[in-house]
């Protein structure tokens, strides 16, 4: 999950190289899948260079790059947006929560870095992937529906993944075993545009079927870093057009953030989807 203010976002840190993700929609789910690593700090592999390069193991957070000061000490400085590549398509553009389109997340984080320490910078987040678009306000009635529809959708996405996963690269064996039980359950409500009453009834009746999908999606989103908390940026895939009622995502998770720390912990996430405290299990987040 991209950097977070309470964690590395607002303070200078030395951190692990961040695993990159791409927004991947499987069925209709922008699941995040690792595709590699990126470190714009000079990372050399030749041993003789390593010794001379103090930036080698000094990793900077998004929007910053490593440079040496006059004492040859590595320091993280804001990345120049001109060192970010031009977008090759609209799909690389991102929208911030102040409704500005950036050419890429690289441009966004470089800009956010220059605002570090300011109120504006603290409030600035990557909102969703793709150029900014009109998002209708989330009505109170829709907000009530959101967790029911999202929960049902998460279950259906996992079932779709299970059905498609011939080559074992979408789900692990352990995950497959869990989804197999859902897939083979004859009581399972098939995917479709169901009335809210039916979704609520199905959740009560088949409660156990929803526990794993809710945990699984948390794990899919918690990637930058994997720390058990979801930041505003990590929730960006849930604001994608393929998501049911995506215009309610931001408002919904604001209501979930019980301690108002701007991060969604697993217990807040699960609780928001109606999972009982006794059924919240970190080991289900794979």
């Amino acid at each position: 999950a991209p950097q977070q203010e309470a964690l590395p976002d607002e303070t200078e840190v030395v951190e692990e190289t961040v695993a990159e993700v791409t927004e991947v929609s499987v069925g209709a789910n922008p699941v995040q899948v690792e595709v590699g690593e990126f470190d714009d700090g000079a990372e050399e592999t030749e041993e003789e260079v390593v010794a001379e390069n103090p930036c080698q193991n000094h990793h900077c957070k998004h929007g910053k790059v490593c440079e040496l000061d006059e004492n040859n000490t590595p320091m993280c400085v804001c990345q120049d947006p001109t060192s970010c590549p031009a977008p090759i398509g609209e799909f690389e553009k991102v929208c911030s929560n102040d409704n500005k389109t950036f050419d890429s997340s690289c441009h966004f984080f470089a800009t956010k870095c220059t605002l570090e320490g300011t109120k504006k910078g603290h409030k600035l987040h990557l909102d969703y992937i793709g150029p900014c678009k009109y998002i209708p306000p989330c009505l109170d009635s829709e907000l009530t529906e959101f967790p029911l529809r999202m929960r049902d959708w998460l279950k259906n996405v996992l079932v779709t993944l299970y059905e498609r996963d011939e080559d074992n690269n979408l789900l692990t064996e352990k995950q497959k075993l869990r989804v197999k039980k859902i897939h083979e359950n004859e009581k399972r409500l098939e995917a479709g545009d169901h009335p809210v009453e039916l979704l609520a009834r199905d959740f009560e009746k088949n409660y156990n079927m929803y526990i794993f999908p809710v945990h699984w999606q948390f794990g899919q989103l918690d990637q930058h870093p994997i720390d058990g908390y979801l930041s505003h940026t990590e929730l960006a895939p849930l604001r994608a057009p393929l998501i049911p009622m995506e215009h309610c995502t931001t408002r919904f998770f604001e209501t979930c953030d019980l301690d108002n720390d701007k991060y969604i912990a697993l217990d807040e996430w699960a609780g928001c989807f109606g999972i009982k405290q006794k059924d919240i299990d970190k080991d289900l987040v794979i």
Epitope: E20, E23, V35, F38, P85, G89, E92, S104, S105
Partner: antibody, heavy 124, light 107 residues
Amino acid sequence: QVQLQQSDAELVKPGASVKISCKVSGYTFTDHTIHWMKQRPEQGLEWIGYIYPRDGSTKYNEKFKGKATLTADKSSSTTYMQLNSLTSEDSAVYFCARLAFGIITTVVRYFDVWGTGTTVTVSS
Amino acid sequence: DIQMTQSPASLSASVGETVTITCRASGNIHNYLAWYQQKQGKSPQLLVYNAKTLADGVPSRFSGSGSGTQYSLKINSLQPEDFGSYYCQHFWSTPFTFGSGTKLEIK
């Protein structure tokens, strides 16, 4: 695993057109751009352009505008490249490749999987 | 458009030797560079991306380095399976141009 299977070799006459295909498997087709490259015997590789199957958007190398047309069929997870007004200069092996990319935290780009290649021979 | 100048065009080396192939970009490509290996009649295979990150399954004897406009691929202790052609490619902006290639042959 991820695979890009290309259509068989083509022998075509000068002035004609040819349509070659690249069928993907092992991942969700609409998630990645598919790029096409040209390689002439004993020569380097040239980037022709890409198609993004999710919305059908394309981008071409200026050099291949009017020569190549890229299309995608979501139902069969296949992208196509049509080459028209063929001359001997178009005789080459054509590759499709998947662009692996990261966009949430920074921009990452590289071709992680390549197609099997399709040989196009233009001869009368 | 950014042009990629690759050298040498060909190279003869023996098993166990170390070789270096270089690529120069006509403009700063900020590490958006990949290296590929291609065997005769086969598709290119990814070796390195982001100028220095080794792709999955690539032996550690391969390493990429460089920044700005100058990049290189080093192969330590050449193995028989390393012989073939090598290409660099930038991903800074479209068109994504390739270097002209380096043919690595057994001495």
